[in-house]
């Protein structure tokens, strides 16, 4: 019961986590610029992995997608890749874990198969969570370093002058969503791995044969039959259950000091 609960909870936690990773990846608020007063009105800038937005105090909002793939910083591309890998792994993990759930019966799937699938999905969730946490952390590091905004400078560009305005970008809501979601996915994955240990069958899958001490003149033949030694009268090869070789499926064997395994 505890195993089923652990597995189910792990699945739900991972599901919430992956939904959060997807939400964070799609959100526009990865970096935000604090409200500043310009000659017109308060303008609020914020950016995501895919587009940049401006919102005015009047409520007007405009977003534009990043114009080129090649012109984007390598770090931004890396963050995108990490988040997408996290989503893909998480989605596959969810698919695998659905079939691995103990409460769901699919054909004659053995517990060992469910255990393996639970472990697989658990590992996928862990990697997915780590990808999301890494992606968000790399982006956060980009914001902290502020490498492009160290000084406000003016220079002459094509067709006029360009001035870089000193600005400070802060962590957007998406970063916190990503960190929390990544953490939840990671925790869910760990729970699935723990559940896997409980699902794995204690006994081995093959039929173990225990050899019990019997009469001094008894020879063993596979299949649990006593062979006649000339003294007995078992000429019809009747199966004998009182001390010969027995499979564990045939009889419950109670240990004694004479048992050899």
């Amino acid at each position: 019961m505890a195993v089923t609960a652990c597995q189910g909870l792990g699945f739900v936690v991972s599901l919430i986590g992956i939904a959060g990773i997807i939400a964070a990846t799609c959100m526009d608020q990865w970096s935000t610029q604090d409200l500043y007063n310009n000659p017109v009105t308060a303008v609020f800038n914020y950016q995501g992995l895919w587009r940049s937005c401006v919102r005015e105090s009047s409520g007007f909002t405009e977003c534009r997608g990043y114009f080129t793939l090649l012109g984007l910083p390598a770090m931004l591309q890396a963050v995108r890749a990490l988040m997408i890998v996290g989503i893909v792994l998480g989605a596959i993990g969810l698919l695998v874990s659905i079939f691995a759930l103990k409460c769901i019966r699919i054909g004659s799937m053995e517990d060992s198969a469910k255990a393996n699938m639970t472990l697989t999905s658990g590992i996928m969730f862990i990697v997915s969570g780590l990808c999301a946490i890494a992606g968000v952390s790399v982006f956060a590091n980009m914001l902290v370093t502020n490498f492009w905004m160290s000084t406000a400078n003016m220079y002459t560009g094509m067709g006029g002058m360009v001035q870089t305005v000193q600005t400070r970008y802060t962590f957007g809501a998406a970063l916190f969503v990503g960190w929390v979601a990544g953490g939840l996915t990671l925790i869910g994955g760990v729970m699935m791995c723990i559940a896997c240990r409980g699902l794995a069958p204690e006994e081995t899958n093959y039929k173990a044969v225990s050899y019990h001490a019997s009469g001094h003149s008894v020879a063993y033949k596979p299949g649990g039959f006593k062979a006649s030694t000339g003294f007995g009268s078992n000429t019809k090869n009747k199966k004998i259950y009182d001390g010969g070789a027995r499979t564990e499926d045939e009889v419950q064997s109670y240990p004694s000091k004479h048992d050899y395994v």
């Epitope: 007007f60 984007l72 006029g160």
Partner: nanobody, 121 residues
């Protein structure tokens, strides 16, 4: 790279009108606001008018009645309709865009090369 192309300047008699236009092209992301500045001979560059993408306008004190700023968001173009021009309006008029590139390059102010407006009889 962002380019600003201004047009519409010229010589006009006092009381006359002119319409300046400025189109931005290139890799433009979030435009915070666009507008016009002017610099008269021997003077500092001063704000004429600005407009946000949402249409909020701002004018330099006494210009509001005579000058009208407007923008076309689809074309990334800003216009300045100047009516009842006076000799003191003679200056080089510079188109202005403030564009936010965020993580791609911060906040940048762009000025055009300027277009000469001369008010003389």
């Amino acid at each position: 790279q962002v380019q600003l192309a201004e047009s519409g300047g010229g010589l006009v008699q006092p009381g006359g009108s002119l319409r300046l236009s400025c189109a931005a092209s290139g890799n433009i992301l979030s435009i915070n606001y666009m507008g016009w500045y002017r610099q008269a001979p021997g003077k500092e560059r001063e704000l004429v008018a600005t407009i946000t993408r949402g249409g909020t306008t701002n004018y330099q004190g006494d210009l509001k009645g005579r000058f009208i700023i407007s923008g076309d968001n689809t074309k990334d173009t800003v216009y300045l309709q100047m009516n009842n021009l006076q000799p003191e309006d003679t200056a080089v008029y510079y188109c202005y865009f403030r564009i936010n590139f965020g993580i791609l390059g911060g906040l940048r102010d762009y000025w055009g090369q300027g277009t000469q407006v001369t008010v003389s009889s």
